[in-house]
């Protein structure tokens, strides 16, 4: 550590550059100032992201990878710092930026939404899972009629371009479907999606967005839901959804609807069975849905309800007449 009476002058890093290394991904690089007097001290660097979203952090190395949207441009600064228990010395900032890509903002797509879904891979002898990706968007309000949009995703080091589009009445792509992707259903990386475009009339502004998998992963409904009535006991059982997550990773909701009187019972469970006491001769429809529990992943979406299964008596007759 520095002694209080020692003086050192900190100089800003040099050759600070921002390189786009992938879809929604940049590499910040710099070099220590060659005129910096080292004097056996541990220099660090403070990186500040100015746009599109403010952030700052410290690092000892001279590069930093950043996952960020780029359609609004990107701006960052870095400075040399030296800190001990009670004081901080800092140089001035070195800054760099990427300008927003060409094209007016109204030409880029809006309302980009994506969902992932897991299926079992039938081509593999071992049990493995395949993740599909479906994205939809709306055409930009200022986009010329001849605009065509193209979608790409990046997950980790894998980048793919969409091959299956849905089109609007003018033939413009407005949705994309990847039946198989490189997305890992239990992965924790960001999913980056980019939609760029072209037109003979004007530049089309690209649009990129980052998605957290837990927030867009559409869980499958539970499998093989069964229900039976024995006297006044309604017993319901089911199996975990098709998913790469193991059996202990699911929360369930059971919905029991008495179709005679409209009464609805919803129970939240962590097991794959439920018994309810029923008190009259009615027909019940039973459904179950699933979500990955917070033990295994951040809270996400519930699955769709399983198809209703009907149990009980459906006769339209008075119950216990005088």
């Amino acid at each position: 550590d520095l002694l209080p009476d020692e003086k050192i002058s900190l100089l800003p890093p040099v050759n600070f550059t921002i390189k786009v290394t992938g879809l929604a991904q940049v590499l910040l690089q710099w070099k220590p100032n060659p005129d910096q007097e080292q004097r056996n001290v541990n220099l660090e660097y403070q990186v500040k992201i100015n746009a599109p979203k403010e952030d700052d952090y410290e690092t000892r190395i001279t590069e930093s990878k950043c996952v960020t949207i780029l359609h609004k441009g990107f701006s960052a600064s870095v400075r040399t710092i030296l800190q001990n228990d009670h004081s901080l010395l800092a140089s001035s900032w070195a800054s760099a930026e990427l300008h927003a890509p060409p094209g007016s903002p109204g030409t880029s797509i809006v309302n980009l939404t994506c969902t992932t879904n897991t299926t079992e891979d039938n081509y593999s002898r071992l049990r493995s899972y395949q993740v599909s990706l479906h994205c939809t968007w709306l055409v930009g309000t200022d986009a010329p009629e001849d605009t065509q949009y193209f979608l790409y995703y990046r997950y980790g080091s894998w980048t793919e371009e969409c091959q299956e589009y849905s089109k609007d009445t003018l033939g413009r792509n407005i949705a994309c479907w990847f039946p198989r992707t490189f997305i890992l259903s239990k992965g924790r990386d960001w999913l980056a999606v980019l939609v760029n475009g072209s037109s003979k009339h004007s530049a089309i502004r690209p649009f990129d967005q980052l998605f957290a998998l837990h927030a867009i992963d559409q869980i499958n409904p539970p499998l093989n839901v069964t229900a039976e009535i024995e006297g006044t006991r309604l017993s319901i059982q089911w199996e975990k959804p098709v998913s790469a997550f193991p059996i202990h990773c699911f929360d369930y909701e059971v919905k029991i609807h008495n179709t005679r009187n409209g009464y609805l019972q919803i129970e939240k469970l962590m097991t794959n069975a439920f018994i309810s006491i029923i008190d009259d001769l009615s027909k019940y429809d039973v459904q179950v849905r699933a979500a990955v529990s917070s033990m295994c992943r951040e809270a996400g979406l519930w699955s769709e309800w399983s198809q209703p299964i009907y149990v009980g008596n459906d006769e339209h007759k008075p119950l216990r007449e005088w």
């Epitope: 609807h257 005679r260 009187n261 009464y263 609805l264 009259d280 459906d314 007449e321």
Partner: antibody, heavy 115, light 110 residues
Framework: EVQLVESGGGLVQPGGSLRLSCAAS????????MTWVRQAPGKGLEWIGI???????YYASWAKGRFTISRDNSKNTVYLQMNSLRAEDTAVYYC?????????WGQGTLVTVSS | DIQMTQSPSSLSASVGDRVTITCQAS??????LAWYQQKPGKAPKLLIY???TLASGVPSRFSGSGSGTDFTLTISSLQPEDFATYYC????????????FGQGTKLTVL
């Protein structure tokens, strides 16, 4: 004869209260969930609330706090207590029995809220 | 609360005509829908429950179909006594969502 008969309607001033009764005959009310529905003059049907066999009651969002449904199985009767009445509560009030739909209705009782 | 939207709000037809009334729920109510007929000055009468099951004593010219959010009431051949107002009602999860009626369809003589 299996029937429902509402009573207790009439003229009431704004801000006043009224309790409507629905008496069942020909069947045991204790075996059925019951509901109240109203119909303003020249308007459509509007669901008010339901009381289940268990005694639990549920209400349309607009009726919560002002309207209360109760039942007395020993009297074979269901009640609708209405408080803080307004001019827009003027309507014919029906009770109905639930059995895969509202299969039995009373004849209705008219409530007029006016000063 | 669930909202029920009925169409048309009024309809003119002649005896012998086939008539269709539709009802749309603001969310999935599966097959939990009832249809009622009401004549002036009278209480409503249950026609159909669970979307398609005819209530006791209702003529077979009345039929219901649909599930989920879209439902239809059909009168295959109108009779003079069928001129009335018709209402749909959700019977799904009343304790959660209420039991709203559609706004009604008034069927009159052309």
């Amino acid at each position: 004869e299996v029937q429902l008969v509402e009573s207790g309607g009439g003229l009431v001033q704004p801000g006043g209260s009224l309790r409507l009764s629905c008496a069942a005959s020909g069947f045991s009310l204790s075996s059925y969930d019951m509901t109240w529905v109203r119909q303003a003059p020249g308007k459509g049907l509007e669901w008010i609330g339901i009381i289940y066999v268990s005694g639990s009651a549920y209400y349309a969002s607009w009726a919560k706090g002002r309207f209360t449904i109760s039942r007395d199985n020993s009297k074979n009767t269901v009640y609708l207590q209405m408080n803080s009445l307004r001019a827009e509560d003027t309507a014919v009030y029906y009770c109905a029995r639930i059995n895969y739909g509202l299969d039995l209705w009373g004849q209705g009782t008219l409530v007029t809220v006016s000063s | 609360d669930i909202q029920m939207t009925q169409s048309p709000s009024s309809l003119s037809a002649s005896v012998g005509d086939r008539v269709t009334i539709t009802c749309q729920a603001s969310q999935n109510i599966y097959s939990n829908l009832a249809w009622y007929q009401q004549k002036p000055g009278k209480a409503p009468k249950l026609l159909i429950y669970r979307a398609s099951t005819l209530a006791s004593g209702v003529p077979s010219r009345f039929s219901g179909s649909g599930s989920g959010t879209d439902f239809t009431l059909t009168i295959s051949s109108l009779q003079p006594e069928d001129f009335a107002t018709y209402y749909c009602q959700s019977n799904y999860g009343i304790n959660y969502y209420g039991a709203a009626f559609g706004q009604g369809t008034k069927l009159t003589v052309l």
